[in-house]
């Protein structure tokens, strides 16, 4: 049971964190204007992994993709190399543990099989977990270092007459979201490999050993237990516990992508 | 046909209050800003503050705090301007106007006149 | 605040000529996000209220005469009247529109001679 739950909310949790690392791709603030100086301001600007935005005072939000690939800085494309890894490893992840869960029958699908692929998918999400942290924590560092070189540079003097500010930009909704999501993602594949050390077949075979008691002999044999475990490779008393399947409406949670005005 | 139609003259006795409506046809009245603009005897004009009509978010300028209250009545699609403490500083010409693109004014009221005399 | 500064304060032309006005803002009105330029220029004519000419610098908005011409970056700006008509002569203001509070700058009265 213990292991049929270990697995179920690796699962769900993994779920949520793709959605999550999903929505963080998509998002547009991964970086938006600092505000420090002034909170109100009638231009705002913000950025994400596929274009940038512009939100007038006026209400009106204007945003444009980058089209080009070769002109973009090598940093960027590498984040959405790795987002968009995360993503695939992820996704390919919770196909694998579908059909690796302990709750759902397919066939005559042996444990050892399923152990497998739990583990599977669990190093998968595990992957998939750490490549989302390090996009975000990678483009989190671009921030932080253009930030400070954007501070030492804050006024460009024109002999002194005219203050030039340049636009700072801190760190964004999106870079939470995706810590957030890759931690979750993480977590769910730790449990999923914690749930196949459950789900694994013993290999140790205990030899019969005989007890010869005064009045007749008994012979004690240790395999007999390891079936009632449910844990054992004699799967004909195997209980098949389906009290940790959830409908999907339950488990899923997407994160929804606003554009803040 | 877009229409901002404001409220009438207004002579007030210094220290009163006064409040200057603009009434708005023709546009989506939450979908944009509504900002107040104050000229003094045919001068320059000097932004007061901005309205958001959906959120009921305002903006000022620092000059007008305390002075100009900006408040919007959905159900009517009008702007209101509430001006206290009055001297005769604030005898001017006050325009409601529409934000659009670029944070131009594209439509402006045709003016309220606030004379402030004892 | 960004004080904007039109020049000259009053221009006296004839029907048909060419006229440029300028207006400075103390910093830049060019936003990175979109490189566009947040400076507005407006006319006002006497007993009337101002009416939006162009915004962005150079975006005429619809329905203005094509004798209008916006340009300029930065801190520099010029409105351009390529062919001066009667209905011309008025006040004409540049607002600053990037950073709050907007501010106006004192205008250019163009007059007949």
């Known amino acids: 049971m213990a292991v049929t739950a270990c697995q179920g909310l690796g699962f769900v949790v993994s779920l949520i964190g793709i959605a999550g690392i999903i929505a963080a791709t998509c998002m547009d603030q991964w970086s938006t204007q600092d505000l420090y100086n002034n909170p109100v301001t009638a231009v705002f600007n913000y950025q994400g992994l596929w274009r940038s935005c512009v939100r007038e005072s006026s209400g009106f939000t204007e945003c444009r993709g980058y089209f080009t690939l070769l002109g973009l800085p090598a940093m960027l494309q590498a984040v959405r190399a790795l987002m968009i890894v995360g993503i695939v490893l992820g996704a390919i992840g919770l196909l694998v543990s579908i059909f690796a869960l302990k709750c759902i029958r397919i066939g005559s699908m042996e444990d050892s099989a399923k152990a497998n692929m739990t583990l599977t998918s669990g190093i998968m999400f595990i992957v998939s977990g750490l490549c989302a942290i390090a996009g975000v924590s990678v483009f989190a560092n671009m921030l932080v270092t253009n930030f400070w070189m954007s501070t030492a540079n804050m006024y460009t003097g024109m002999g002194g007459m005219v203050q030039t500010v340049q636009t700072r930009y801190t760190f964004g909704a999106a870079l939470f979201v995706g810590w957030v999501a890759g931690g979750l993602t993480l977590i769910g594949g730790v449990m999923m490999c914690i749930a196949c050390r459950g789900l694994a077949p013993e290999e140790t075979n205990y030899k019969a050993v005989s007890y010869h008691a005064s009045g007749h002999s008994v012979a004690y044999k240790p395999g007999g237990f390891k079936a009632s475990t449910g844990f054992g490779s004699n799967t004909k008393n195997k209980k098949i516990y389906d009290g940790g399947a959830r409908t999907e409406d339950e488990v899923q949670s997407y994160p929804s992508k606003h554009d803040y005005v | 046909e877009f229409q901002l139609q404001q409220s009438g003259p207004e002579l007030e006795k210094p220290g009163a209050s006064v409040r200057i409506s603009c009434k708005t046809s023709?546009?989506?009245?939450?979908?944009?800003?509504m900002n107040w603009v104050k000229q003094s005897n045919g001068e320059s004009l000097e932004w007061i503050g901005n309205i958001d009509p959906y959120y009921g978010g305002t903006s000022y300028n620092q000059k007008f705090k305390g002075k100009a209250t900006l408040t919007v009545d959905k159900s009517s699609s009008t702007a209101y301007m509430q001006l206290k403490s009055l001297t005769s500083e604030d005898s001017a010409v006050y325009y409601c106007a529409r934000m659009y693109h670029g944070n131009a004014f594209d439509y402006w009221g045709q003016g309220t006149t606030l004379t402030v005399s004892s | 605040d960004i004080v904007m500064t039109q020049s000259p304060s009053s221009l006296t032309v004839t029907a048909g000529e060419k006229v440029t006005m300028s207006c400075k803002s103390s910093q830049s009105l060019l936003n990175s996000g979109n490189l566009k330029n947040y400076l507005t220029w407006y006319q006002q004519k006497p007993g009337q209220p101002p009416k939006l000419l162009i915004y962005?610098?150079?975006t005429r908005k619809s329905g203005v005469p094509d004798r209008f011409t916006g340009s300029g970056s930065g801190t520099d700006f010029t409105l351009t009247l390529s062919s001066v008509q009667a209905e011309d002569l008025a006040v004409y203001y540049c607002?600053?529109?990037?950073?709050?509070?907007?501010?106006f700058g004192a205008g250019t009265k163009l007059e007949l001679k």
């Open positions: 023709g546009y989506s009245f939450t979908g944009y800003n």
């Open positions: 962005w610098a150079s």
């Open positions: 607002q600053n529109d990037y950073s709050y509070p907007l501010t």
